[in-house]
């Protein structure tokens, strides 16, 4: 996502429409304290970053408070007074939604409905991944709201679940980030478990009458 002006690579992450993190990787300036200057409005004067990220004792990024800003971030990374990278971006194209909160499971026979608190903004996908020890890989289902029903589960099997939120690429573009996964929770016969056994337990033999 960062063009390489004078060998500077940048990364922007807009955490849950609250905080913007801009980091840079500038091999040419690896031992230099580059400064970060920004504004949210093309008409304003630039402010300098007050919350730098450091790597090996040198500036490598900036954290900005930008709660629910529907703005463009205009920024300049400078070596002294010399700009080494200047750009402007809609921050929302680099959205990383927050991890799902208040995840709940509602079981009904061979199906489970996973719900969580919807985020306050839209054009998101709520993805539930699940697997049993019998599965070689995670299965996935996603919906536009955090209300995802998965059917056809085996009530006798133990299943692990986790949930995340993704910005719709169609709307926000290709440079967003999925949220972190929620904690893994394990369920068997509609009851929560500490864990699912890594090696599947063989099915109990059916007793003939």
């Amino acid at each position: 996502q960062g063009g390489a002006a004078e060998g500077v690579q940048i990364q922007i992450i807009y955490f849950n429409l609250e905080t913007v993190q801009v980091t840079w990787n500038a091999s040419k300036y690896s031992r230099t304290n580059l400064t970060f200057h920004y504004r949210f409005n093309g008409d304003e004067a630039y402010d300098q970053c007050t919350n730098y990220l450091l790597q090996e004792g040198h500036t490598s990024g900036c954290l900005l408070d930008a709660e629910q800003r529907d703005d463009i971030l205009y920024f300049s990374i400078r070596n002294g007074t010399h700009p080494v990278f200047t750009a402007s971006r809609w921050m929302v194209y680099y959205l990383k939604p927050s991890s799902p909160k208040h995840v709940r499971f509602s079981w009904h026979q061979d199906a489970v409905t996973v719900t969580c608190s919807d985020l306050s903004y839209g054009d998101l996908l709520y993805e539930v991944q699940y697997r049993s020890p019998f599965d070689t890989e995670w299965q996935s289902k996603q919906e536009n709201t955090c209300n995802v029903t998965i059917e056809g589960l085996d009530a006798e099997k133990c299943y692990s679940f986790w949930v995340r939120v993704k910005a719709m690429e169609d709307v926000y573009g290709p440079d967003t980030y999925p949220s972190d996964w929620s904690e893994v929770t394990c369920w068997q016969r509609g009851e929560i478990r500490d864990a699912c056994a890594e090696t599947p337990t063989p099915p109990k033999p059916k007793l003939s009458k």
Epitope: R89, W90, P174, D175
Partner: antibody
Framework: QIQLGQSGPELKKPGETVKISCKAS????????MSWVKQAPGKGLQWMGW????????RYADDFKGRFAFSLETSASTAYLQIYNLKNEDTATYFC??????????????????WGQGTLVTVSA | DIVMTQSHKFMSTSVGDRVSITCKAS??????VAWYQQKPGQSPKLLIY???TRHTGVPDRFTGSGSGTDFTLTLNNVQSEDLADYFC????????FGSGTKLELK
């Protein structure tokens, strides 16, 4: 289906004021922002700015600050463009076009999928 | 403002030909580029967004490509109904349009 219907052509004298309407239907009006685009005769497209239909807050492109005003009549799902103190160079077709972003979140002016049919404003003494 | 330059004001083609319309941004815009088709007396119609995603209902003979500063709209097997003006637009920051390229018959 989603439609944006604009008011009819206007013939005005320099110094007068014009108000163009854009009535939206087929979706929840306050969910998506509305942009305005100018096209002078035989020329290209110029983004004039947009209005957040949820908050009513307008944003104007640099070339359209001063004599131009965006407004809303939310109950009628209608956006307005008003141009004051008209000049000859304001002669153009003006389009309203719906934003692709949900306005309760962000105002990123993205791709424009839905357009009004355009309103021709002619300014002539 | 970011300037979008369409260097060819006119491009001549024949039905069945392949034609490429180019657009250059004055600074890196990532893939935040759309392409529109406009016919005389009509509103612009979205063809491509995010540089290469075809909008719903747009024939697959229209293809967008590019990232950063250089973008191309390619029309394969040009049809007579494709003769129109084509505009690129960036939306990495406040939107700006290219000046347009008119596709006409040879």
């Amino acid at each position: 289906q989603i439609q944006l219907g604009q008011s009819g052509p206007e013939l005005k004298k320099p110094g007068e004021t014009v108000k163009i309407s854009c009535k939206a239907s087929g979706y929840t009006f306050t969910t998506y922002g509305m942009s305005w685009v100018k096209q002078a005769p035989g020329k290209g497209l110029q983004w004039m700015g947009w209005i957040n239909t949820y908050s009513g807050v307008p944003r104007y492109a640099d070339d359209f600050k001063g004599r131009f005003a965006f407004s809303l009549e939310t109950s009628a799902s209608t956006a307005y463009l008003q141009i004051y103190n008209l000049k000859n160079e304001d002669t153009a077709t003006y389009f309203c076009t719906r934003e692709g972003f949900i306005t309760t979140v962000v105002g990123a002016a993205g791709r424009f999928v839905y357009w009004g049919q355009g309103t021709l404003v002619t300014v002539s003494a | 403002d970011i300037v979008m330059t369409q260097s060819h004001k006119f491009m001549s083609t024949s039905v069945g030909d392949r034609v490429s319309i180019t657009c250059k941004a004055s600074q890196d815009v990532g893939t935040a580029v759309a392409w529109y088709q406009q016919k005389p007396g009509q509103s612009p119609k979205l063809l491509i967004y995010w540089a290469s995603t075809r909008h719903t209902g747009v024939p697959d003979r229209f293809t967008g490509s590019g990232s950063g500063t250089d973008f191309t709209l390619t029309l394969n097997n040009v049809q007579s109904e494709d003769l129109a003006d084509y505009f690129c637009q960036q939306y990495s920051t406040y939107p700006t349009f290219g000046s347009g390229t008119k596709l006409e018959l040879k």
